[in-house]
Interface confidence: medium
Amino acid sequence: AAIIPQSSACPNTEAKDFLQNVKVNLKVFNSLGAKVSSRRPSDYLNRSTSPWTLHRNEDPDRYPSVIWEAQCRHQRCVNAEGKLDHHMNSVLIQQEILVLKREPESCPFTFRVEKMLVGVGCTCVASIVRQAA
Amino acid sequence: AAIIPQSSACPNTEAKDFLQNVKVNLKVFNSLGAKVSSRRPSDYLNRSTSPWTLHRNEDPDRYPSVIWEAQCRHQRCVNAEGKLDHHMNSVLIQQEILVLKREPESCPFTFRVEKMLVGVGCTCVASIVRQAA
């Protein structure tokens, strides 16, 4: 993480005493300029050798309120014949994301930042064969 | 793109009028923070049939300042013999994440939320064969 604006006005802060509520501009900007969310949904989830499904996770007090979480469709991968290959495993690629949660009953609105671990998609890996000692 | 809570004390607020600077609790950023869960070991980037590398994207005014973005190692997928399979493509799985950008020269610290599209990992899909008309 970064930036210690060192000045008498912004002194170092101990974690336990850290000013918990800071001002955050919630007008969400896209760092790519173009609308990120306007990208076409990918069909990789069906075409992959490790296909996945997307499950809706909704929380009206969270931004983003709807998060689509991936789950691998099979434990194994699908081969060229469309059959499951028992030497290959479908594994979930996970990623932490930041979300904003509204503090209950807060008025004016107060939010807290939370980390959330979500499944993004699946990939195919060779099974690890454990050697007997 | 913000959460607009409903309550009699906090009347409905149109998005365009939504208070841009709201209070946000950043407690999650105590250096080891509220970890979602213990990080799971993932060497999928090397073991996948569509392996990927991680590339450093740095912006000192952003949290996280350094984001390691996935890029597929090959255009094709790697088969059981370790050779590239020309019927199968490695494709990038992308995910939108929220990042915090520090407003320049702000003290006390003021941040804005931005969306960023990042590469998370790669998956293997069958090549689409385009039929000639």
């Epitope: 980390k115 | 950023f29 080891l32 996280p64």
Partner: antibody, heavy 126, light 107 residues
Framework: EVQLVQSGAEVKKPGESVKISCKAS????????ISWVRQAPGQGLEWMGG????????DYAQKFQGRVTITADESTTTAYMELSGLTSDDTAVYYC???????????????????WGQGTTVTVSS | EIVLTQSPDFQSVTPKEKVTITCRAS??????LHWYQQKPDQSPKLLIK???HSISGVPSRFSGSGSGTDFTLTINGLEAEDAATYYC?????????FGQGTKVDIK
């Protein structure tokens, strides 16, 4: 590559304080945290505390709470560790270490120590 | 705090031999486990991060494995320059803690 250069050896009397500096070069100072780790003669490594730069937050090991202060000055890309109320048990080599705090392999905040200063020897003796 | 226990404390090994050092955590730490090498009168050097991820510039003979509470550092084909003390380090929970160290010397 980030390089960390620490201030020179110190000899102190019991009850005094010591302040060690750690000057960083190469790479953006804003993009990582600094932890302080000490090593008593013939002993292992002991984490004292660290600073997470983006929010200017410090965390200290309970053992050192109230005796240690970690600060940093972005303008000179230097981190500092001050330890007060010294006793002979504080005789050790003190290291600063870079904590990347990257978003890496799917997770926020990496916490390995990927670059270390050369160490500063502090001797406490009456 | 999380206690890390390394074994053995000391190992004397002939060159080209395989060296295995284990580190056991007092509770589940996922893969928040890193390995360092420290030579006499030098600073520690990161060898492996997050249990199994190699570090650029570190020889490929160093590898790591494990998750949860049991971790292993392996040196495949020890070289004379590998004589050092090796430490594991957990970053799952504050405070960061280190193992007591394993000293490896060359026969």
């Amino acid at each position: 590559e980030v390089q960390l250069v620490q201030s020179g050896a110190e000899v102190k009397k019991p009850g005094e304080s010591v302040k060690i500096s750690c000057k960083a070069s190469g790479g953006s100072f804003r993009s990582y945290g600094i932890s302080w780790v000490r090593q008593a003669p013939g002993q292992g490594l002991e984490w004292m505390g660290g600073i997470t730069h983006f929010f200017g937050i410090t965390d200290y090991a309970q053992k050192f709470q109230g005796r240690v202060t970690i600060t940093a000055d972005e303008s000179t890309t230097t981190a500092y560790m001050e330890l007060s109320g010294l006793t002979s048990d504080d005789t050790a080599v003190y290291y600063c270490a870079r904590e990347p705090n990257d978003f890496w392999n799917g997770y926020y905040d990496t916490h390995d120590f990927d670059s270390w200063g050369q160490g500063t020897t502090v001797t406490v003796s009456s | 705090e999380i206690v890390l226990t390394q074994s053995p404390d000391f190992q004397s090994v002939t060159p080209k031999e395989k060296v295995t050092i284990t580190c056991r955590a007092s509770q589940n730490i996922g893969s928040e486990l890193h390995w360092y090498q420290q030579k006499p009168d030098q600073s520690p050097k990161l060898l492996i991060k997050y249990a199994s991820h190699s570090i650029s510039g570190v020889p490929s003979r160093f590898s790591g494995s494990g998750s949860g509470t049991d971790f292993t550092l392996t040196i495949n084909g020890l070289e004379a320059e590998d004589a050092a003390t090796y430490y594991c380090h957990q970053s799952d929970t504050l405070p960061h803690t280190f193992g007591q160290g394993t000293k490896v010397d060359i026969k």
